[in-house]
């Protein structure tokens, strides 16, 4: 069964297909489930989840974050601005999701599923935003050098980076989910 679909839906072809909003909502919740599984392995493997040194490592990462100006919060919400921010943010997260590949032992398939499902989610959202201004895509060269830099870190920093990516991606998706429900 593909991510974002119920086996019941697949088995019942007479039922209407999911609307765009339903697909997006379901896809985000599927990815969030995957993140939870990855976080579980990360937290079991190291003490990063309780570490107080997060801020130290976070300074070296430029993870996408929702800010007031992005129009995704309850105060100052703006449907168009927010949709652009969600898509841009997900595109920026892609390099970090690539970094997560090979960072897991027992959850290797789950890490791949999160990455692939995010690509599908981006496609869903781009269809929804087809009338909006062009969305800027991250520069592939910049992404390649960032990936090399992250992979060259020592073990402790790599563990911390993994933890921070998962935590930030979870927060970003939760904010996106809340915002998309007003769209």
């Amino acid at each position: 069964v593909p991510p974002g679909e119920d086996s019941k839906d697949v088995a019942a072809p007479h039922r209407q297909p999911l609307t765009s909003s339903e697909r997006i909502d379901k896809q985000i919740r599927y990815i969030l489930d995957g993140i939870s599984a990855l976080r579980k392995e990360t937290c079991n493997k190291s003490n990063m989840c309780e570490s107080s040194k997060e801020a130290l490592a976070e300074n070296n990462l430029n993870l996408p974050k929702m800010a007031e100006k992005d129009g995704c919060f309850q105060s100052g919400f703006n449907e168009e601005t927010c949709l652009v921010k969600i898509i841009t943010g997900l595109l920026e997260f892609e390099v970090y999701l690539e970094y997560l590949q090979n960072r897991f032992e027992s959850s290797e398939e789950q890490a791949r599923a999160v990455q692939m499902s995010t690509k599908v989610l981006i496609q869903f959202l781009q269809k929804k935003a087809k009338n909006l201004d062009a969305i800027t895509t991250p520069d592939p060269t910049t992404n390649a050098s960032l990936l090399t830099k992250l992979q060259a870190q020592n073990q402790w920093l790599q563990d911390m980076t993994t933890h921070l990516i998962l935590r930030s991606f979870k927060e970003f998706l939760q904010s996106s989910l809340r915002a998309l429900r007003q769209m």
Epitope: K8, R15, Q16, L18, T19, S21, E22, D25, Q74, S75, G76, F77, N78, E79, E80, L177, R178, A179, R181, Q182, M183
Partner: antibody, heavy 120, light 111 residues
Framework: EVQLVESGGGLVQPGGSLRLSCAAS????????MSWVRQAPGKGLEWVSR????????YYADSVKGRFTISRDNAKNTLYLQMNSLKPEDTAVYYC?????????????WGQGTQVTVSS | QSVVTQPPSVSGSPGKTVTISCAGT?????????VSWYQQLPGMAPKLLIY???KRASGIADRFSGSKSGNTASLTISGLQSEDEADYVC??????????FGGGTHLTVLG
């Protein structure tokens, strides 16, 4: 204090038109998806239509599709329902409702309603 | 479009517990956790009690609780009080981008 005040209801003949308005205050109107819900005399509630916070997406109940149009003016903090080709079965109290923030399909504030009567 | 089914009426004595059911299909009540419950007093607009199946709305007493099993959602009111006498309506998201309401249940508090 959140307030939703409906207006524009009244008596109209079958086939006629009406435009309902809902003036919102006490909250950032442009941040919320909004809906119209109606209640026929002595009957249950019926969901009519929904509009997204920025007005990009709209949804309608099958019973009103093609006849009713939901719209909003965020600069005026106002929600509208244009009702054309009205039928006697459209007779009801029409409520303007706000969707709870970040929640899928729950209505946290309701106006007091405006009565629409379709009769010859 | 079929209405989600609720019993027309239920009753209970003060201090007791009552449960109101809301039976739908896999396309509405059974689809996701998108059930909400409302209290409606005569001549008044409905008031949100429960959303997302089991989350209490702001300011709602913990005597009110919600749950769901399969295609049926339930609202439970414990420690019944005379002021609980009202109509209770469930609502659910329905696949395809619409919503559906139950027919409503009138709660009578005896005595």
């Amino acid at each position: 204090e959140v307030q939703l005040v409906e207006s524009g209801g009244g008596l109209v003949q079958p086939g006629g038109s009406l435009r309902l308005s809902c003036a919102a205050s006490g909250f950032t109107f442009s941040s919320y998806a909004m809906s119209w819900v109606r209640q026929a005399p002595g009957k249950g509630l019926e969901w009519v239509s929904r509009i997204s916070s920025g007005g990009i997406s709209t949804y309608y109940a099958d019973s009103v599709k093609g006849r009713f149009t939901i719209s909003r003016d965020n600069a005026k903090n106002t929600l509208y329902l244009q009702m054309n080709s009205l039928k006697p079965e459209d007779t009801a109290v029409y409520y303007c409702v706000r969707y709870a923030w970040g929640v899928q399909w729950a209505f946290d504030f309701w106006g007091q309603g405006t009565q629409v009567t379709v009769s010859s | 479009q079929s209405v989600v089914t609720q019993p027309p009426s239920v009753s209970g004595s003060p201090g007791k517990t009552v449960t109101i059911s809301c039976a739908g299909t896999s396309s509405d009540v059974g689809y996701g956790n998108y059930v909400s419950w409302y209290q409606q007093l005569p001549g008044m607009a409905p008031k949100l009690l429960i959303y997302d199946v089991s989350k209490r709305a702001s300011g709602i007493a913990d005597r009110f609780s919600g749950s769901k099993s399969g295609n049926t959602a339930s609202l439970t009111i414990s420690g019944l009080q005379s002021e609980d006498e009202a109509d209770y309506v469930c609502a659910s998201y329905r696949r395809g981008g619409t919503a559906v309401f139950g027919g409503g249940t009138h709660l009578t508090v005896l005595g």
